[in-house]
């Protein structure tokens, strides 16, 4: 009993601590840790039925998808998959959890966001954090040196997400990657082309793709006087420049990460620059940067990349941005990130600050990490941030009060009189067998008005009405729900007529 009282007191104290930290706007990591402690204390306390009412909800950072949301999602996926297939990609799938060892050491500072699973009989497992590391493991395991693949699946991150801005702990990623030894920058350019094609097709607003190169970053840090051990941590500070001012980034680098102020200032001179191919040319003339082998390689490749992007007709969408320093450890070359410049300004709609909607880069060393002999398979890829896109599309449709169909039913089989259930069942079965998407109401004697109303609500375009007279005449009354126009169609012609009216191919081959 004393044990329970002590635990209850600790839960109370820990709860107060968490609230205090939130009020003080303490670091996200500290709050996350203290919240995790609170949850562990509560778990030890166990349920006290007299006090605790179980709240029915999805776990933090997750959500259910309603039929309406799923309809949006499927449309978005359709655009993406069609583009991936147009570019000749195969599709793969991998397990939702991996051996913990597979994921360790691949994500740098982000490793703390990996979900570890409780021990399930000896294997230490973690939920996948992205689709790239599992892809690299797949290549190494199957000794593949050449593949162009896409993979659409859920990934998991122990983030503290702002769900209103399309950020979750469980979310979909849509990845496209090209693995293999090819001439420089051709696959990289295609990845950027794919990114632009998809974002343009989705019509979610104007966007810009920021491009940089890990080698330029590393070279720049080296000439500015950053020690090797600090490269990655300084990268993560620089990457915040799209969200906060240079002063704040500098303070973090100097105050929290121990960088000398003059080194930070030298970095600042570079990372605040962005432009096009002219900036690449300018930096190739930079007396210090051009002396650095890594940076020079990176700049040379970027120059070539811009040539290809011009040929692909997308150079106007690309900006060379020296502050882009994506937070994942595995990038080795070109890196890129697409951001929305603004969401469509619909009447009465709040502008959405959803930031990055796609990203990617070159990661030539990742497969080698899994190969016993360290054999490298060069890879480049991209990931579409579909959750953010879903949020934008959903909000836009809500603002437009647009009706979204959540089913694809083409026709409702209805009856105008009683005692025609058997006939309706026979007809709906004929339609299903012919590949028509059809429904009927699950009532013996539904009122015609109710059946028509159901079509209005569900957006079903056609009603096939059976009546006693129609049965005698061997016809079916086909009614258009929107125009209310009715025509008698011979029963043997019904399938063809429905297909004609709904634009479905006549053969389901």
């Amino acid at each position: 009993m004393a044990e329970r009282a002590a635990l209850e007191e600790l839960v109370k104290l820990q709860g107060e601590r968490v609230r205090g930290l939130k009020q003080q706007k303490a670091s996200a990591e500290l709050i996350e840790e203290e919240v995790a402690k609170l949850l562990k204390l509560k778990a030890q306390l166990g349920p006290d039925e007299s006090k605790q009412k179980f709240v029915l909800k999805t776990p933090k950072g997750t959500r259910d998808y309603s039929p309406r949301q799923m309809a949006v999602r499927e449309k978005v996926f359709d655009v993406i998959i069609r583009c991936f297939k147009r570019h000749g990609a195969e599709v793969i799938d991998t397990p939702v959890f991996e051996l913990k060892e597979t994921l360790m050491g691949k994500y740098g500072e982000d490793s703390k966001l990996i979900y570890d699973l409780k021990d399930q009989g000896g294997e230490l497992l973690s939920l996948r954090y992205d689709l790239t590391v599992p892809f690299a493991r797949y290549l190494a395991m199957n000794k593949l040196t050449n593949i162009k693949r896409y993979h659409i699946a859920k990934v998991y991150r122990r983030d503290n997400p702002a769900m209103t801005r399309g950020r979750y702990r469980e979310f979909y990623q849509c990845d496209f990657d090209i693995a293999g030894n090819f001439d420089p920058m051709i696959p990289d350019a295609e990845c950027l082309k794919i990114m632009c094609e998809i974002l343009s097709s989705l019509q979610i607003g104007d966007f810009l793709v920021k491009v940089n190169d890990r080698r330029i970053l590393d070279g720049m840090f080296a000439i500015c006087g950053v020690s090797d051990s600090k490269f990655r941590t300084i990268c993560s500070s620089v990457d915040k420049l799209d969200k906060v001012s240079w002063e704040e980034v500098k303070n973090e680098m100097v105050g929290e990460k121990g960088l000398a102020p003059e080194v930070a200032d030298r970095i600042g001179d570079y990372v605040q620059q962005h432009g096009g191919v002219s900036l690449v040319e300018q930096l190739l003339q930079d007396p210090k940067l051009s002396q650095n082998k890594q940076a020079l390689e990176g700049l040379g490749d970027l120059k070539l990349l811009f040539e290809y992007l011009t040929l692909f007709g997308i150079d106007d969408k690309i900006s060379f941005d020296l502050s882009l320093a994506r937070g994942l450890d595995y990038y080795t070359g070109v890196i890129y990130e697409a951001v929305l410049l603004q969401t469509p300004a619909q009447a009465g709609e709040e502008p959405l600050g959803v930031g990055s909607v796609a990203a990617g880069g070159r990661y030539d060393g990742l497969v080698g990490m899994f190969d016993p002999k360290g054999r490298k398979v060069p890879c480049v890829g991209l990931s579409i941030g579909v959750e953010r896109i879903f949020s934008i599309v959903e909000q836009r449709l809500e603002a437009l009060e647009e009706k979204i169909r959540t089913t694809e039913t083409q026709v409702l089989v209805a009856s105008a009189q009683k005692k025609l259930l058997e006939e309706r069942l026979k007809l709906v079965s004929e339609l299903w067998d012919a590949g028509i998407k059809a429904e009927l109401l699950y009532k013996k004697n539904p009122k015609l008005l109710n059946q028509l109303q159901y079509c209005e609500e569900a957006g079903i375009p056609l009603v096939a009405i059976i009546g006693e007279q129609e049965l005698k005449d061997g016809v079916i009354k086909l009614r258009s729900v929107t125009s209310r126009e009715e025509v008698d169609v011979r029963r043997e012609d019904l399938v063809e007529e429905i297909k004609r009216r709904t634009g479905q191919p006549l053969c389901i081959c």
């Epitope: 002590a6 635990l7 007191e9 600790l10 104290l13 990591e29 204390l41 030890q44 570890d116």
Partner: antibody, heavy 120, light 107 residues
Framework: QVQLVESGGGLVKPGGSLRLSCAAS????????MSWIRQAPGKGLEWVSY????????KYTDSVRGRFTISRDNAKNSLYLQMNSLRAEDTAVYYC?????????????WGQGTLVTVSS | DIQMTQSPSSVSASVGDRVTITCRAS??????LAWFQQKPGKAPKLLIF???NLESGVPSRFSGSGSGTDFTLTISSLQPEDFATYYC?????????FGQGTKLEIK
């Protein structure tokens, strides 16, 4: 019953390295935050570092940050402290300690300690 | 960092005496305080946690009180095995800090 047994201490020259280990038994090691606490000869106690149950979180006192690394292997029920660039002021008995109620930063169970002497 | 100051640094008392040791934090720590007992050549032993909760197996003559910045450990009737050094420790924020210790000696 809960047992924590430290090992790996000894005499080392300034600038040298040592790796301390702590073997845990008698409880579900992977459920608990663990820590290293030290006590210089004839002096008070100093909390050196801690590590969370899953190794997600680690912290170090200022005087050892960048030189010491705490780690754990839940499969082996073991806690470690890698000590590099050792200084004379690191001389102390190092205790491995288990948190109270898994996550409360109060040392409920302690090992017997292992002596680290840094001297030229 | 939060500083913990214990007083007195040493105290002489006899078996059967009532002894009070105080601990002051340099800033408020709510009830995040523990008391430990340490005997020469041994590891410390937890007595009290979150200011006033007696650790299981610890005799009831030990008690703790206080919150915020001022805390006390009281031994109601000293026993021969109680002569040792006592430390307070704050568990409010890292680095978790201990008081300098109070040595309880036989008069």
């Amino acid at each position: 019953q809960v047992q924590l047994v430290e090992s790996g201490g000894g005499l080392v020259k300034p600038g040298g390295s040592l790796r301390l280990s702590c073997a845990a038994s008698g409880f579900t090691f992977s459920d608990y935050y663990m820590s290293w606490i030290r006590q210089a000869p004839g002096k008070g106690l100093e909390w050196v570092s801690y590590i969370s149950d899953s190794s997600r979180y680690t912290k170090y006192t200022d005087s050892v940050r960048g030189r010491f690394t705490i780690s754990r292997d839940n499969a082996k029920n073991s806690l470690y402290l890698q000590m590099n660039s050792l200084r004379a002021e690191d001389t102390a008995v190092y205790y491995c300690a288990r948190y109270l109620y898994q996550v409360i930063a109060i040392a409920k169970s302690w090992g017997q300690g292992t002596l680290v002497t840094v001297s030229s | 960092d939060i500083q913990m100051t214990q007083s007195p640094s040493s105290v002489s008392a006899s078996v059967g005496d009532r002894v009070t040791i105080t601990c002051r934090a340099s800033q408020g720590i709510s009830s995040w305080l523990a008391w430990f007992q340490q005997k020469p050549g041994k590891a410390p032993k937890l007595l009290i946690f979150v200011a006033s909760n007696l650790e299981s197996g610890v005799p009831s003559r030990f008690s703790g009180s206080g919150s915020g910045t001022d805390f006390t450990l009281t031994i109601s009737s000293l026993q021969p095995e109680d002569f040792a050094t006592y430390y307070c420790q704050q568990a409010e924020s890292f680095p978790y800090t201990f008081g300098q210790g109070t040595k309880l000696e036989i008069k």
